[in-house]
Amino acid sequence: GPETLCGAELVDALQFVCGDRGFYFNKPTGYGSSSRRAPQTGIVDECCFRSCDLRRLEMYCAPLKPAKSA
């Protein structure tokens, strides 16, 4: 997999992984850490300053909207 992803490469990678539904650069509030004082981790920290994998990228995808009811 990639070593690190920064700038346009990171954006292209996120679009590829998430599709057109979009993505966050920071995890949504309340995502992951239970501590309110914990510094927010962003994708740049996780994938540009160090290497990350597909699973890590997927964590920053915007959620799917709920399926329409039958």
Partner: antibody, heavy 120, light 107 residues
């Protein structure tokens, strides 16, 4: 513009594997994401997975996870799709399809397709 | 996975007719739908992307509309070369999925 070139046909035995190639020429391989899409005879289109060749990021459809491997060789501008444990239901035309990076799934560029026939 | 349902599955029409093909998504996908044309023995060709944007080099008689879960491809005045199979595709979220196709035949 990039042209995607595929070989014509392969005949494989059930249980074997096939490796299909897709060579890009006449443009910048690095500016594309490559997906693999198959079409069984008389049927619709089915996305198998894709790769951004220069970044080495690969994403697979769950249906094919564990049975398909998508790779790319930057030095030859060639993408590959290997499908294992072939069965008769895998008989199909396998297309590589390119989308510009940032618009990975807008397939504005297609190979001519490789017909894979699985038969004993 | 997001299901894309196309209707009708086949359609007979005459040269000069205006035809519309509909595609419905199993969940809301904003405007992230593409339309392709495929002729026998050939690879698909991108006609419309992002629901309504015309791909470069494609005739302006093709147009796309819709958002959310319902999308349409319209051919304003059928030409002989338009008789083919048409597929919709969602790019909103992998796995990328396609409609089952609409075969457009000469009446």
């Amino acid at each position: 513009q990039v042209q995607l070139q595929q070989l014509g046909a392969e005949v494989k035995m059930p249980g074997s594997s096939v490796k299909v190639s897709c060579k890009a020429s006449g443009g910048t391989f690095s500016s594309y994401a490559i997906s693999w899409v198959r079409q069984a005879p008389g049927q619709g289109l089915e996305w198998m997975g894709g790769i951004i060749p220069t970044l080495g990021i690969v994403k697979y459809a769950q249906k094919f996870q564990g049975r398909v491997t998508i790779t790319a060789d930057k030095s030859t501008s060639t993408a590959y799709m290997e499908l294992s444990s072939l069965g008769s239901e895998d008989t199909a035309v396998y297309y590589c399809a390119g989308g510009p990076r940032g618009y990975s799934y807008n397939f504005d560029n297609w190979g001519q397709g490789t017909l894979v026939t699985v038969s004993s | 996975d997001i299901q894309m349902t196309q209707s009708p599955s086949s359609l007979s029409a005459s040269v000069g007719d205006r035809v519309t093909i509909v595609c419905r998504a199993s969940q809301t996908i904003s405007r992230y739908v593409n339309w392709y044309q495929q002729k026998p023995g050939k690879a698909p060709k991108l006609l419309i992307y992002a629901a309504s944007s015309l791909q470069s080099g494609v005739s302006s008689r093709f147009s796309g509309s819709g958002s959310g879960t319902e999308f349409a491809l319209t051919i304003s005045s059928l030409q002989p070369e338009d008789f083919a199979t048409y597929f919709c595709q969602q790019t909103y979220s992998p796995p990328i999925t396609f409609g089952q196709g609409t075969r457009l035949e000469i009446k």
